[in-house]
Amino acid sequence: QLSLPSILPNENEKVVQLNSSFSLRCFGESEVSWQYPMSEEESSDVEIRNEENNSGLFVTVLEVSSASAAHTGLYTCYYNHTQTEENELEGRHIYIYVPDPDVAFVPLGMTDYLVIVEDDDSAIIPCRTTDPETPVTLHNSEGVVPASYDSRQGFNGTFTVGPYICEATVKGKKFQTIPFNVYALKATSELDLEMEALKTVYKSGETIVVTCAVFNNEVVDLQWTYPGEVKGKGITMLEEIKVPSIKLVYTLTVPEATVKDSGDYECAARQATREVKEMKKVTISVHEKGFIEIKPTFSQLEAVNLHEVKHFVVEVRAYPPPRISWLKNNLTLIENLTEITTDVEKIQEIRYRSKLKLIRAKEEDSGHYTIVAQNEDAVKSYTFELLTQVPSSILDLVDDHHGSTGGQTVRCTAEGTPLPDIEWMICKDIKKCNNETSWTILANNVSNIITEIHSRDRSTVEGRVTFAKVEETIAVRCLAKNLLGAENRELKLVAPTLRSELTVA
């Protein structure tokens, strides 16, 4: 644990002359900050700066150029990195008094005049004098109220509901505060706060609306923090709903939003009776104009097997909401004529998911598919090519002999997607062709045998093998294969001499 920071001057309290300057130095083993009486708006004449010194300690100086009654209060120096909400502000304190003959009491905000008492608890009526020597009395409608007074805090006691006034006399001049109203309140020990933003994405010129609702609490202070706050851009409203239970609805409206209004919108509710605080936050983004982003979950070339069911999912981010359509080969997809369906589902505020579903893929489903997303500001599309993969099959296997030369050509026509490869095998011993070991693959480099392949279209291929001379009966096998399957057919090639003998016979 770090030892507490130290303050110079090393005093519990100090009286500073009106309009004079004063400075407080804080020394700590880690970075230190100051907490002081005025709010940020009132503290234009309070300067805080870091100072270098050779002691190895961190030094932060608080300087007031012209002390006024409003500077009266508790100044606390603390380690700023160790602050946790439920812990005491851990630091060193000094109380500064700035006596002002014309200002007997430290100026207060209007909410300070409302004193909330809970269940007969003691309360503090916070009239603090600018001079510790000033005598003060507390009065209500019945006269002087006996209560203990501490010039640093005010009157402490158990007070009945009603108005109270503090009275002081400075150099023969009498001062009275405006009435402090003591109010009894039933408050819950927790704050039930809900935030609602119907939209978190906007474009320039639109109106941002955020609401925060506090339930079952009568007196709540709610502060908004948002990007346009410094410019006073937001309009705040409070609606009190009493039926069926108390509900305070605070609305922040930012008209004519710009990109600079993007950021965190936070409402912080604080219960008047105690330091119970609850915060809620939403992140709003404002875009110069509408936008569309398309994120496919698949590539630009996709394959589907024949009869397969396949889904193609595209994520779309868009604002304002997009219209989404699908095209096939640049024509609108007519779903009712095909076993293809599309749908669009809203996943989040600006996220959509569109699916193209192929129910039972057919060859004719191959083609170019395009998703088009458009709104009033943007159009985006994504196109992919779909190939329906079909197992290879042999359409035709025929031979063609070359008359007297004794040469013969075998043609094998096959189809499939991807285009099948064609392989040739021969069996030279016709009696043993039932045995698989009798078949050999026909190599390309065998003399007097020529093999060639021609593709007829995207899915049909023709392979040819030409035998310069067939001297004995052989069997030829055409094997067509692709990724999805293989098929083979066989054909007998009879030597021309044998054929003529057969013809004579």
Epitope: Q1, E86, E278
Partner: antibody, heavy 120, light 107 residues
């Protein structure tokens, strides 16, 4: 060094009450918020309640609201958890936890835990 | 309340390998996130706070990153003593909530 020692756990019947205590030492107890966190057998951690350094604020997880009360006695450096109308689902090891003693916001010191078993 | 979701539920890693644990918050918790390690029969121990600040005495092989809703705890080279259950916890909102835990076990 910082020490948190829980006591008061045991076996109790459903609907009955139990009071857990946590004795703190090694730091300025009156300056720090204190929490109770529990862990059912074989399960994860669940935050139960917090009390501000000065006792003025108390928060609870919804499942124990109205049944459990967290309190502290800064003069005795002791944290308490009064558990009424106990249910079987309250069976857990209860840890007393210090917050922000050396770091910001996180639970930096834990006791060894005390087992509460609610069973008929 | 903010729901914290950790993944995976169990991570099997060999000693010396890197382990990466994820924690997701149902809404932004800024950098108000802590990581704890718990071994059987022991109380949890704070490792990381402020999403990425390592507690004094915690080995440098432990590191945290992320802000908003997505967070990661990385253990660069697992030692035998690192096999345990790890929890993330947010302290941005009441009630404080923990993730369900990730068990890091020996592969």
């Amino acid at each position: 060094q910082v020490q948190l020692v829980e006591s008061g756990g045991g076996v109790v019947q459903p609907g009955r009450s139990l009071r857990l205590s946590c004795a703190a030492s090694g730091f300025t107890f009156s300056r720090y918020g204190m929490h109770w966190v529990r862990q059912a057998p074989g399960k994860g951690l669940e935050w139960v309640a917090v009390i501000w350094y000065d006792g003025r604020n108390k928060y609870y997880v919804d499942s124990v609201k109205g049944r459990f009360t967290i309190s502290r006695d800064n003069s005795k450096n002791t944290l308490y958890l009064q558990m009424n109308s106990l249910r079987a689902e309250d069976t857990a090891v209860y840890y007393c936890v210090g917050v922000g003693i050396t770091v910001t916001g996180a639970f930096d010191y834990w006791g060894q835990g005390t087992l509460v078993t609610v069973s008929s | 309340e903010i729901v914290m979701t950790q993944s995976p539920a169990t991570l099997s890693v060999s000693p010396g390998e890197r382990a990466t644990l994820s924690c997701r918050a149902s809404q932004s918790v800024r950098s108000n996130l802590a990581w704890y390690q718990q071994k059987p029969g022991q109380a949890p121990r704070l490792l990381i706070y402020g999403a990425s600040t390592r507690v004094t005495d915690i080995p440098t092989r432990f590191s945290g990153s992320g802000s908003g809703t997505e967070f990661t705890l990385s253990i660069s080279s697992l030692q035998s003593e690192d096999f345990a259950v790890y929890y993330c916890q947010q302290y941005n909102n009441w009630p404080r909530t923990f993730g369900q835990g990730t068990k890091v076990e020996i592969k």
